[in-house]
Interface confidence: low
């Protein structure tokens, strides 16, 4: 019978400000009151399914009841008016949703941009969250003409793209209106010429041309965006080598007006460079374009800029009157080779005698020389020309090397193995550093590097491993030949030994025992052995620990008990920790030698 509601709630669709007060009234219809035999006293108010305490109700008259909320904190409140009918059954009369939120704040930071070829877009800061549907409208006008409103879309409420084409050199006034159910506010107006808001398209068709005459330059050309007919452009040109991650920039003052080419100077020969370019209005008013697509080019070759590192090794087993000498050199890095290396030229001149020439593709040359003094030179050649020569004196067989470096030290730092020394008083032409891994299982295979004569500290430029003992040799090289080599051992990073020492008895007496052990093989040391600890105990006694210097290979335990089983083990320690060796047992005799019961 009662298809239409039993009553209604006023107001029907309330929108209220957060933390404000609100009153709703439920009015019952006469036919409903008659049907259910109820009046306003029977009304039960509920929010979100929960009954509101009666103390919040006011009975206005027999048909109407009100409820008041103070400090509304919920964004959405489902409010229902219900009546208690016969048998305390609840009957829903009407329901509403109270929506709460905040009025809009004044929009701030209004700014506009004209992307070349597109219409003007403006954006702003809409202020705090209102929790309500809030509409933003961008308004714009000339002094003589009003443009159509731009209504921001729901998914992008703080920006809008206008519907009209941009006209340059005429000022436009722009502002934003924000409106919701609780109020309406307007931003500050901004007035500008759209030409000062332009973001040009990036320059395109960027290309790079090299020069055979100059190996240090590359010429860039590009096509400017169409906006060049409206504004004067300035540019940023950036470049980097192909493998670099950071960009260098041409000084902006060199590219401060419209152009379509530029020559980049002071580049490295035979190097691939990557370029990009962007542009904007020359007075800096507006926006930089996006970067152009990248373009790359390779500078022309130049002759090698440096002589290679050059050294020699003499085979110790030499035939009467002759010796086998291996000349060795290092490949130049690309930034010194300045092109594709074709070959190496070696000359050997016996002291004040004839000259021998060799053209070599490898980085070593083995020759048989007499016991005389020789002068060796080495040049490297590419398409453009030859490097300066590296010169090496190979002294006569009876040469006595002197003047070593002093205070040689080696130490790890920042994951590198550093070597330093005090320079000799004599004038050193260069230093040769050689290093190899000491091992009981394999020969010491040497790597090497060359340093200028002015250097007294450097790091080893090889692939070094942790926990390996490196034998490092530094040889000063003088005009008349090499000086005395000095050597030192070092670790890139130490670790505890892989094995501990194996202890045994050398001699056992009634009250003492002489223990002995072998030095640990270098392959298991993993670092410098700093000290040993001997641990010994009886089956029932506490363990005793004795520290022993790492130079020792035997130790005497004294004050032992006769006729007693002892357990002994030994640990070796590097700077990074220790490792125990196997446990060994021995028994002291009941009587000393010659002693009877």
């Amino acid at each position: 019978e009662l298809l239409d509601p039993c009553g209604y709630i006023s107001p029907e669709s309330p929108v209220v400000q957060l933390h404000s007060n609100f009153t709703a009234v439920c009015v019952l219809k006469e036919k409903c009151m008659d049907y259910f035999h109820v009046n306003a006293n029977y009304i039960v108010w509920k929010t979100n399914h929960f009954t509101i305490p009666k103390e919040q109700y006011t009975i206005i008259n027999r048909t109407a009841s009100s409820v008041t909320f103070t400090d509304i904190a919920s964004l959405n409140i489902q409010l229902t008016c219900n009546i208690l009918t016969f048998g305390q059954l609840e009957q829903n009369v009407y329901g509403i949703t109270i929506i709460s939120g905040l009025p809009p704040e004044k929009p701030k930071n209004l700014s506009c941009i004209v992307n070349e070829g597109k219409k003007m877009r403006c954006e702003w800061d809409g202020g705090r969250e209102t929790h309500l549907e809030t509409n933003f409208t961008l308004k714009s006008e000339w002094a003589t003409h009003k443009f159509a409103d731009c209504k921001a879309k729901r998914d992008t409420p703080t920006s809008c793209t206008v519907d009209y084409s941009t006209v340059y050199f005429v000022n436009i006034e722009v502002w934003v209106e924000a409106e919701n159910a609780l109020g309406k506010v307007t931003s500050d107006h901004i007035n500008f010429d759209p030409v000062y808001k332009v973001k040009p398209n990036p320059p395109h068709n960027l290309s790079v041309i090299n020069s055979e005459e100059l190996s240090s330059i590359l010429k860039l050309t590009w096509t400017n965006p169409s906006i060049k007919s409206v504004i004067i452009l300035k540019y940023n040109i950036q470049y980097r080598t192909k493998d670099a991650s950071t960009w260098s920039q041409i000084p902006p003052e060199d590219t401060a007006s419209t152009r379509s080419s530029f020559t980049v100077q002071d580049l490295k020969p035979f190097t691939e460079y990557v370029f990009r370019i962007r542009c904007m209005k020359e007075d800096g008013k507006g926006y930089w374009s996006d970067w152009s697509e990248e373009a790359s080019g390779i500078t022309y070759e130049d002759r090698p800029s440096k002589a290679p590192s050059f050294w020699y090794k003499i085979d110790p087993s030499h035939t009467q009157g002759y010796r086998t000498v291996q000349l060795v050199w290092k490949t130049l890095p690309p930034f010194e080779a300045n092109g594709k290396i074709l070959d190496y030229e070696v000359t050997l001149t016996r002291w004040k005698s004839h000259l021998q020439n060799y053209t070599v593709n490898a980085t070593k040359l083995t020759v048989n020389l007499t016991n005389d003094r020789y002068l060796a030179t080495l040049t490297v050649r590419n398409l453009v020309g030859k490097s300066d020569a590296a010169v090496l004196t190979i002294p006569a067989c009876d040469f006595q090397a002197t003047h070593p470096v002093m205070d040689l030290k080696a130490f790890p730092k920042d994951n590198m193995l550093w070597v330093e020394w005090t320079t000799p008083r004599e004038s050193v032409k260069k230093y040769i550093l050689e290093w190899c891994v000491l091992s009981d299982k394999a020969p010491c295979i040497t790597d090497w590097q060359q340093e200028d004569g002015t250097v007294h500290r450097t790091y080893l430029r090889g692939n070094l491993a942790e926990s390996k003992c490196y034998l490092i040799t530094v040889t000063p090289v003088y005009a008349d030949g090499p000086g005395s080599p000095e050597s030192i051992k070092a670790y890139l990073k130490q670790a505890p030994p892989s094995k501990g020492p194996t202890v045994r008895t050398k001699k056992v007496g009634k009250n003492e025992a002489v223990l002995e052990w072998d030095q640990l093989p270098v392959d298991v040391q993993n670092g410098f052995i700093r000290n040993y600890t001997i641990f010994y105990r009886t089956i029932i006694g506490n363990e005793t620990a004795v520290n022993v210097d790492s130079s020792h290979t035997e130790y005497t335990l004294s004050s032992l008990t006769s006729d007693t089983l002892y357990m002994v083990r030994m640990a070796a320690y590097t700077d990074e920790g220790g490792k125990d060796g196997p446990e060994f047992t021995f028994t002291t005799p009941k009587f000393a030698q010659g002693e009877i019961e």
Epitope: K46, T47, N48, H49, F50, T51, A73, S74, L75, N76, Q78, L89, E90, N92
Partner: antibody, heavy 120, light 108 residues
Framework: QLQLQESGPGLVKPSETLSLICTVS??????????WGWIRQPPGKGLEWIGN???????YYNPSLKSRVTISVDTSKNQFSLKLSFVTAADTAVYHC????????????WGQGTMVTVSS | DIQMTQSPSSLSASVGDRVTITCRAS??????LNWYQQKPGKAPKLLIY???SLQSGVPSRFSGSGSGTDFTLTISSLQPEDFATYYC??????????FGQGTRLEIK
């Protein structure tokens, strides 16, 4: 994401007061759209609603337990608590705290529950 | 108080079966009805709210229907992880919030 964790003694003597705390993490207990509730489940039986609390402090209790129940909130610690006085063996149950979504009218997130035994 | 009655109180079914559980309210509760799933030793988990709305993250094989006094929970194709106890709950006339006595769903 939001999580609830019940804590409190597992054994309470008859006639004493059962006290439990529910700690809310990953969200604010003062949130506008949620109530916070306690539900219990005696061993092998169904679910019984104890009461709900709104972040502002207003409470709603099951009339069958109303005289013995107090639910309160400590917003600074993001916790709400249950006190049930004059307990008997019939109050032995797993006690769950849960979040009541006022828009859906349902307990949408639950704590894993804590077993409370009433025994001397 | 509004009483909620579930039927059956227990039922056996096989993986792949279509299963229906019903819940009846002692008076009209409009569509203020929720369904929960509870596995042994775990907390209940909300499946359906407002009679037919699927809770986020719940598989679509679960569905709810009904309004007034009669409601159903349907599992369209039973999966091994669905064997549990299911509870209905009304939120129309509160306090108190009331639950059904539960329906235990077992493997046949």
């Amino acid at each position: 994401q939001l999580q609830l964790q019940e804590s409190g003694p597992g054994l309470v003597k008859p006639s004493e007061t059962l006290s439990l705390i529910c700690t809310v993490s990953g969200g604010s207990i003062s949130s506008n759209n949620y109530y916070w509730g306690w539900i219990r489940q005696p061993p092998g039986k169904g679910l019984e609603w104890i009461g709900n609390l709104y972040g502002s402090g207003s409470t709603y209790y099951n009339p069958s337990l109303k005289s013995r129940v107090t639910i309160s909130v400590d917003t600074s610690k993001n916790q709400f608590s249950l006190k049930l006085s004059f307990v008997t063996a019939a109050d032995t149950a797993v006690y769950h705290c849960a979040r009541w979504d006022t828009n859906g009218g349902a307990f949408d997130i639950w704590g894993q529950g804590t077993m409370v035994t009433v025994s001397s | 108080d509004i009483q909620m009655t579930q039927s059956p109180s227990s039922l056996s079914a096989s993986v792949g079966d279509r299963v229906t559980i019903t819940c009846r309210a002692s008076q009209s509760i409009s569509s203020y009805l929720n369904w929960y799933q509870q596995k042994p030793g775990k907390a209940p988990k909300l499946l359906i709210y407002a009679a037919s709305s699927l809770q986020s993250g719940v598989p679509s094989r679960f569905s709810g229907s009904g309004s007034g006094t009669d409601f159903t929970l349907t599992i369209s194709s039973l999966q091994p992880e669905d064997f549990a106890t299911y509870y209905c709950q009304q939120s129309y006339s509160t306090p108190p919030i009331t639950f059904g006595q539960g329906t235990r769903l077992e493997i046949k």
